[in-house]
């Protein structure tokens, strides 16, 4: 293509000048004789015309073929379709034109989407055809195949386009370039009609591809980074298909000095450094093929950043607790740098920061450290503390942000039963929240064991993390390498920058959590009375075991007892409890022997079942009630018991045998089933009565007696008896005994209301004992019937009855109240009995 | 304290191209623009242009289209390239440092002599 | 670009006379951005007043500044020996930053 002008990504001056007569003049192309024919067979030369004293007689009738002004050649070639046998008619001022020729600046490029090729006729300034309309063509071709093709394509396989020159004095021309086509020659000329004259330019030859113009970088942003510098940055334009180099410039307008600056990047961000504050920055960045010829874009749209009066850096600092970290400050003021000497620091206005924490950086940049942080104290919605850079005695109202968290966060890891899956644990309540914050668990698996000193490797894997209801997160490794140490720590992400809890190394195999002993029982062994309980372990972890037994009562609040069994092969346990009769809530859990590990979960719960383990101790109280004539002969007597406690029937009854022996009859026996009343004739001078408790094993041994005899009815030791109200709850007792020959066993008290037809109430009470408490619920305004019956080995003695209260010395009693309780003979037999009785009495 | 110490050959022909550098010892490199000046002989002082620690440059049109100002920041220093010099380029060259936030020179060089002669 | 001239070319006084040097551009220069250098036969200029009047760092007090707009002048008050040099003016408040062409003061 030796005959083609190749374009440059320049701007370049299409010359027309007048013909010249004589040929010596004109500057042939390389490899052009004077004699060669061009492609129109017409011994015609493209030059370019120096002279101008040529005479234009017959321009109307001429097209003029034009050069490319260049300052090193002259070249010019032929374009190939000539325009034959057309007449134009020139209006052309030839004078004008014979002194300067006709100029044309032209451009071309691709445009940044690839699609259109594009070449701008513009119309110079002192283009003696600049008055007259332009028409403008350009014919193009792209040929298919270069290598096979005739060193200039042949006439009429040129495609033509029409030019826009819409705007006055420049025309815009559009080829469209198939996108595989962009690495090919684009064949072109120009053909210019103005004034009647046709200009036409030399043959030109074009690889669109290393004409491309870039559209403008896009989203121009600054910022100033945390180290004090002005970040540049944007975006390259879509759809260019190779790397570009950037030109960035920028002017720095502040009150103290102006400049303007420029640089030459491949990177799409870049920084300034030494930014000054109170100063506006204006920046624009272009665009051009780093590797190869191209065309710079178009500036972008200029975008300004203004600096503060007071700029830090970094703004904001979030650390840790225990850290130290430094905050740097340019200061003006009053269109002054302030020197770095006179900058003093301040801590929320409050607290000047000591001068031995300041480091003077430079001429005009001031540091403060600030060691060992504390964790930052929330002041009303302010999370950070405010650090302050001052010329001397005044303070901008700017600051610099201090956020200091303490960033202990405790993971705890646990490896289920079954060696599948670990589960670990974390919460944020320890650590202050900061809004904006994210947090991530991060870890590090490491192919064996866990090293020493855990920290945190920079290739780390997120994992995640679900919040529990308890304000846990929870994160679940599945599947797990038991023997693999893990890494872990907590991330907590902020704009600001990211924290990292202290690392924590799990070793899987450390941390399993056993699944709970199975097949739990327990029982309460028969005629021994031990709590006998027994397990069998889980199958993992094949570790020895130990053991923890938990027991107690059942019931809504379980006191637990604890017992520890450290024997791995053991597999029950009996232990000894107080209450052989109760239901006992018994659970295991198993954890490793070595330490490692985590106590299983309490297994399930194993109830004993309440049976008798021996006969019971001992029969019920009674009591009779003897109705009818008191003169009669044969009287009905009704006995009453109090149902056997747990204790002393362990651990049930099932009925009550009454054991009837009268010298006369015998003995016999009658069953009276669960009841606890029963009522028999008593027709004989005396009748013994016994009831015995019977359970599941036998009969009560230790049972007590009663013996109804008429003579013993009579008996009476009771001197006197006396009632003394103490309150409304409690009536002290008190009597005087005569001596007996008979064997005294004990006393029943009765007491009934008399205005009521209520039951009679009964205790039984020690013989040795000459007052008693009564506990009940007396009604001040009733009247009581207090009875006092001595009993004998021999039978029931006379009772001893009162039908109200004592009047003279009631008074004495209630002052004497605190004495009484106090005296010995209320010691600690009556005591124990008074308890027990009251005990029973809530029970009639 | 700020000490600018410049080095480079005194003599040069027509057309050869002038290398001047420049090391800056003591004080901060970082954040400053690194300027050169020069004044012919007998004459005034002329700004030659400057140059940031980060690479971006600012000449005087009248030179721009010879001189390079180039930085090397691991070194701390800065250099000084004017191609195609003529006798008109003959002066002592200066290297300063501009004063942070103004367009002044605080801290000179010791001046060099280039001439340029056949 | 903007032109600095100064006037006079030279100045003959005396140690402990006041001195007065004038700087006037071609176009406005904001005070912000004119300064003033004192430099000695075979020396480095030196910085002696930034901003039009403030004073540069080891500066004695006895030069001052001022002036603003197009026209800018150096008093020194008292001249001492040490003083009689050349004094330049420059302006950077538009691009390129330009010096004026000197004025000598010289011991009478």
């Known amino acids: 293509f030796n005959l083609s002008y190749p374009i440059t990504p320049w701007r370049f001056k299409l010359s027309c000048m007048p013909p010249n007569s004589t040929y010596d003049y004109f500057l042939l192309p390389a490899g052009l004789s004077k004699n060669t024919s061009n492609l129109n067979g017409h011994y015609e030369t493209a030059v370019e015309f120096n002279s101008s004293d040529t005479h234009f007689s017959n321009l109307s009738k001429t097209t003029f073929h034009c050069c490319f002004r260049s300052e090193q050649d002259r070249n010019c070639s032929l374009c190939a379709d000539n325009i034959e046998g057309k007449t134009f008619v020139s209006t052309v001022n030839s004078s004008v034109f014979q002194q300067m020729g006709a100029n044309w600046n032209i451009q071309c490029w691709l445009k940044g989407d690839l699609k259109l090729f594009i070449c701008y006729v513009e119309s110079l300034f002192k283009n003696p055809f600049k008055n007259y309309k332009h028409k403008v063509h350009l014919l193009y071709v792209l040929p298919e195949v270069l290598e096979d093709s005739p060193l200039v394509p042949q006439k009429g396989s040129f495609q033509m386009v029409h030019c826009n020159c819409s705007v006055h004095e420049r025309c815009e021309c559009l080829v469209p370039v198939p996108t595989a086509k962009l690495n090919d020659t684009l064949l072109m000329c120009l053909k210019i009609t103005s004034g009647g004259v046709i200009f036409q330019s030399p043959l030109m030859s074009v690889q669109p591809i290393n004409m491309v113009k870039p559209d403008p970088p896009l989203g121009l942003r600054m910022e100033i980074t945390d180290d004090g510098n002005l970040k540049i940055s944007w975006s390259s334009p879509p759809l260019v298909p190779f790397p570009l180099q950037y030109e960035v410039k920028y002017s720095e307008n502040s009150t103290t000095v102006i400049r303007e600056a420029d640089k030459i990047v491949s990177a799409t961000s870049l920084l300034v450094d030494g930014i000054l504050p109170g100063s506006s920055y204006e920046v624009q960045v272009r665009g051009k093929r780093l590797d190869g010829p191209g065309i710079w874009s178009d500036w972008s749209t200029p975008h300004v950043f203004t600096t503060q009066d007071v700029i830090y850096f970094p703004p904001k600092i979030l650390t840790s607790v225990g850290s130290n970290v430094s905050f740097h400050c340019i200061y003006k003021n009053e269109n002054k740098i302030v020197s770095s000497k006179k900058i003093v620091w301040w801590m929320n206005l409050a607290e000047k920061i000591p001068q031995s924490q300041y480091d003077v950086v430079s001429d005009h940049v001031s540091k403060v450290t600030f060691f060992n942080l504390n964790e930052t104290k929330p002041r009303g919605k302010f999370t950070y503390d405010a650090v302050y850079c001052c010329n001397e005695h005044e303070c901008h109202h700017r600051y610099a942000e201090l956020y200091v968290i303490d960033v202990n966060i405790n993971i705890s890891c646990e490896t289920d039963g079954h060696l599948t899956k670990m589960t670990c644990r974390w919460s944020t309540n320890t650590i202050q929240s900061l809004a904006g914050s994210t947090l991530q668990l991060r870890y590090r698996r490491s192919s064996l064991y866990c090293f020493d000193i855990p920290s945190i490797h920079p290739i780390s894997k997120p994992k995640d993390c679900y919040l529990q209801s308890d304000g846990f997160y929870e994160c679940v490794f599945q599947p797990i390498f038991l023997l693999s140490g893990y890494t872990m720590w907590i991330r907590i992400n902020h704009p600001l920058g990211s924290l990292d809890s202290p690392p924590t190394c799990v070793l899987p195999d450390s941390v399993v959590k056993p699944l709970p002993p199975s097949s739990v029982k327990a029982e309460i062994i028969k005629n021994i009375g031990l709590l006998k309980i027994s397990w069998e372990k889980p199958v993992f972890p094949e570790n020895n075991l130990q053991f923890q037994i938990r027991y107690g009562l059942s019931g809504k609040e379980i006191q637990w007892k604890m017992y520890d069994v450290y024997d791995a092969k053991s597999k029950s346990v009996s232990l000894p409890v107080p209450d052989f009769c109760a239901v006992y809530a018994v659970q295991v859990r198993c954890k490793r022997s070595d330490g490692l590990g985590l106590w299983s979960n309490w297994s399930n719960p194993a109830y004993t079942v309440v049976m008798d383990i021996k006969v019971p101790m001992r029969g019920p109280e009674f009591w009779r009630i003897i109705n009818g004539d008191t003169m009669k002969k044969e009287k009905n007597v009704t006995l009453l018991w109090k149902p056997l406690m747990k204790n002393d029937s362990l651990c049930s009854v099932q009925r009550y045998v009454i054991n009837h022996h009268t010298s006369c009859n015998g003995t016999w026996s009658e069953d009276v089933g669960n009841h606890t009343k029963f009522t028999f004739l008593w027709t004989e001078q005396a009748h013994t009565v016994t009831v015995l408790a019977i359970n599941s094993i036998g009969a009560s041994v230790a049972n007590f007696n009663l013996t109804f005899s008429w003579p013993m009815s009579k008996v009476n030791i009771v001197q006197s008896l006396s009632a003394y109200p103490l309150n409304s709850s409690c009536v002290i007792l008190s009597w005087i005994l005569s001596p007996s020959d008979y064997k005294l066993m004990y006393f029943i008290i009765e007491w009934k209301n008399l205005n009521e037809d209520g039951e009679i109430k009964w205790l039984r009470i020690s013989s040795s004992v000459k007052k008693y408490y009564i506990h009940d619920h007396f009604i001040p305004i009733e009247k009581y019937q207090f009875s006092l019956y001595p009993i004998f080995m021999e039978g029931v003695g006379k009772p001893k009855i009162i039908n109200s209260f004592a009047q003279d010395n009631t008074e004495k009693h209630q002052n004497d109240e605190q004495k009484l309780i106090s005296e010995e003979d209320l010691g600690g037999e009556q005591k124990l009995i008074s308890e027990e009785d009251l005990h029973h009495h809530h029970h009639h | 304290q700020v000490q600018l110490q410049q080095w480079g050959a005194g003599l040069f022909k027509p057309s050869e191209t002038l290398s001047l550098t420049c090391d800056v010892y003591g004080g901060s490199f970082r954040g400053y623009y690194w300027s050169w000046i020069r004044q012919p002989p007998g004459k005034g002082l002329e700004w030659i242009g400057e140059i940031s620690y980060s690479g971006f440059t600012n000449y005087n049109p009248s030179l721009k289209s010879r001189v390079i100002i180039s930085i090397d920041t691991s070194k701390n220093q800065f250099s000084l390239k004017m191609s195609s010099v003529t006798a008109a380029d003959t002066a002592v060259y200066y290297c300063?440092?501009?004063?942070?936030?103004?367009?002044?020179?605080?801290?000179w060089g010791q001046g060099t002599l280039v001439t340029v002669s056949s | 670009e903007i032109v600095l001239t100064q006037s006079p070319g030279t100045l003959s006084l005396s140690p402990g006379e006041r001195a007065t040097l004038s700087c006037r551009a071609s176009?406005?220069?904001?005070?912000?951005?004119l300064a003033w250098y004192q430099q000695k036969p075979g020396q480095a200029p030196r910085l002696l007043i930034y901003g039009a009047s403030s004073r540069a760092t080891g500066i004695p007090d006895r030069f001052s500044g001022s002036g603003s707009g197009t026209d800018f002048t150096l008093t020194i008050s008292r001249l001492e020996p040490e003083d009689f040099a050349v004094y330049y003016c420059?302006?950077?408040?538009?691009?390129?930053?330009?010096f004026g062409q000197g004025t000598k003061v010289e011991i009478k």
């Open positions: 420059q302006q950077y408040g538009s691009s390129p930053w330009t």
């Open positions: 300063a440092r501009v004063t942070y936030g103004y367009g002044t020179f605080d801290y």
């Open positions: 176009q406005s220069v904001s005070s912000s951005y």
